[in-house]
Interface confidence: low
C-alpha cells in the first residue's frame, strides 16, 4: 500500500467565489474516497466535480475533486480522503 | 477511540467569565471537529458550537454567539471554551464531544468528556 | 429552530419487555446533501451521554443489536427489543441536518 499524497488548492471563480481542488497523487491501490466537506458533512454529489482516478507513470494512482464556495467561508471546508483503511482530512489554504 | 478529560468544576459570580478545556489522546487531534453543549440540571442538552482543530474554523449556535468563544491548542490537543457575561441562566454541565465521521458514516457527538459543573452564584 | 419533540415523557417498562420511543421533528430533516442526521443518545444518571443509532439506523459501534432505529422526513422511532436494566435512563433524539443542531426533550425509561 502506498498513501497519497494529498493537496488543496484555490482559484478565483466568479465574484464572490473560489473554486478549492482538492488532489490526491502517488496511491495504491486505486480504491479512495475524496470528498469535500462542509461543517464536517459531505458535499452532495452534484456539487462536486471529480477527476477520474488515473496511473501517473509510476504504478499508483492520482484523482482530484473540486467545488466551488463562498469567499470568506473556507474554514467551514475540509477535502476528507479515505484510503486502505487510514484517513485524512485537509483545510483550505488561506 | 481515544480519550477526553474536561477540568474540574468551577464556582464563579454573575458577570465573571470561566475557561473550561477539553484534553484529547489516543487519536489525531488536527482531524477532528469538537463540539460543546449545556445541559442544565433535570434538562436536556443544547449544542454550542464546533471547532474544527485543523484550522480554528468554528460554527456557532446563534443563541451563543456572544456568550461562548471557542478555540484550540494544537500543541497540547486541547479544545477550550471561554464563557463570558457569567449568570445564573449559565449554570450547567458542559460537555465537549468528538464529531466521527470516518468513511461514509456521520454521527456527530460520537466521544464524550465527563462534563465540567459550572456554577455561577453570588 | 428545528423543534424535537419526544414522546412519551416517561415510559414505564418490565424487564425483558420490548419498548417503543417516538421523536418527531417540526420540519423535515434531510440534510442537503441527502442523508437524514437523525441520533439517539442514552444518558444514564450521573453520566455523559452514549451514541447509540447514527443517521436513523446504524448502530454505533459497541452497540448492541436489541436496539433498532428507524423512520424519515419526521416521525423516527427507537426501539429496545428486550430491556435489559443497563438500558434503563434518558433517552434523547437528535437532528444535525440544520443550524443549529437540535435535542429532544427526552425520554425517560424506567422499571415499571
Known amino acids: 500500500t502506498v498513501p497519497p499524497m494529498v493537496n488543496v488548492t484555490r482559484s478565483e471563480a466568479s465574484e464572490g467565489n473560489i473554486t478549492v481542488t482538492c488532489r490526491a497523487s502517488s496511491f495504491y491501490p486505486r480504491n479512495i474516497i475524496l470528498t469535500w466537506r462542509q461543517d464536517g458533512v459531505s458535499l452532495a454529489h452534484d456539487t462536486q466535480q471529480w477527476g477520474d482516478v488515473l496511473p501517473d507513470g509510476n504504478g499508483t494512482y492520482q484523482t482530484w475533486v473540486a467545488t466551488r464556495i463562498c469567499r470568506g467561508e473556507e474554514q467551514r471546508f475540509t477535502c476528507y480522503m479515505e484510503h486502505s483503511g487510514n484517513h485524512s482530512t485537509h483545510p483550505v489554504p488561506s | 477511540q481515544g480519550q477526553m478529560q474536561q477540568s474540574g468544576a468551577e464556582l464563579v459570580k454573575p458577570g465573571a467569565s470561566v475557561k473550561l478545556s477539553c484534553k484529547t489522546s489516543?487519536?489525531?487531534?488536527?482531524?477532528?471537529?469538537i463540539s460543546w453543549l449545556k445541559q442544565k440540571p433535570g434538562q436536556s442538552l443544547e449544542w454550542i458550537a464546533w471547532?474544527?482543530?485543523?484550522?480554528?474554523?468554528?460554527s456557532y449556535n446563534q443563541k451563543f454567539t456572544a456568550k461562548a468563544q471557542l478555540t484550540v491548542d494544537t500543541s497540547s490537543s486541547t479544545a477550550y471554551m471561554q464563557f463570558s457575561s457569567l449568570t445564573t441562566e449559565d449554570s450547567a454541565i458542559y460537555y465537549c464531544a468528538r464529531h466521527d465521521y470516518y468513511g461514509t458514516s456521520g454521527a456527530w457527538f460520537a466521544y464524550w468528556g465527563q462534563g465540567t459543573l459550572v456554577t455561577v452564584s453570588a | 429552530d428545528v423543534l424535537m419533540t419526544q414522546t412519551p415523557l416517561s415510559l414505564p417498562v418490565s424487564l425483558g419487555d420490548q419498548a417503543s420511543l417516538s421523536c418527531r421533528s417540526s420540519?423535515?430533516?434531510?440534510?442537503?446533501?441527502?442523508?437524514?442526521?437523525l441520533e439517539w443518545y442514552l444518558q444514564k444518571p450521573g453520566q455523559s451521554p452514549k451514541l447509540l443509532i447514527y443517521?436513523?439506523?446504524n448502530r454505533f459501534s459497541g452497540v448492541p443489536d436489541r436496539f433498532s432505529g428507524s423512520g424519515s422526513g419526521t416521525d423516527f422511532t427507537l426501539k429496545i427489543s428486550r430491556v435489559e436494566a443497563e438500558d434503563l435512563g434518558v433517552y434523547y433524539c437528535?437532528?444535525?441536518?440544520?443550524?443549529?443542531?437540535?435535542f429532544g426533550g427526552g425520554t425517560k425509561v424506567e422499571i415499571k
Open positions: 471547532i474544527y482543530a485543523g484550522t480554528g474554523g468554528t
Open positions: 443517521k436513523v439506523s
Open positions: 420540519q423535515n430533516i434531510v440534510h442537503i446533501n441527502g442523508n437524514t442526521y
Open positions: 437528535f437532528q444535525g441536518s440544520h443550524v443549529p443542531w437540535t
Open positions: 489516543g487519536f489525531t487531534f488536527s482531524d477532528n471537529y
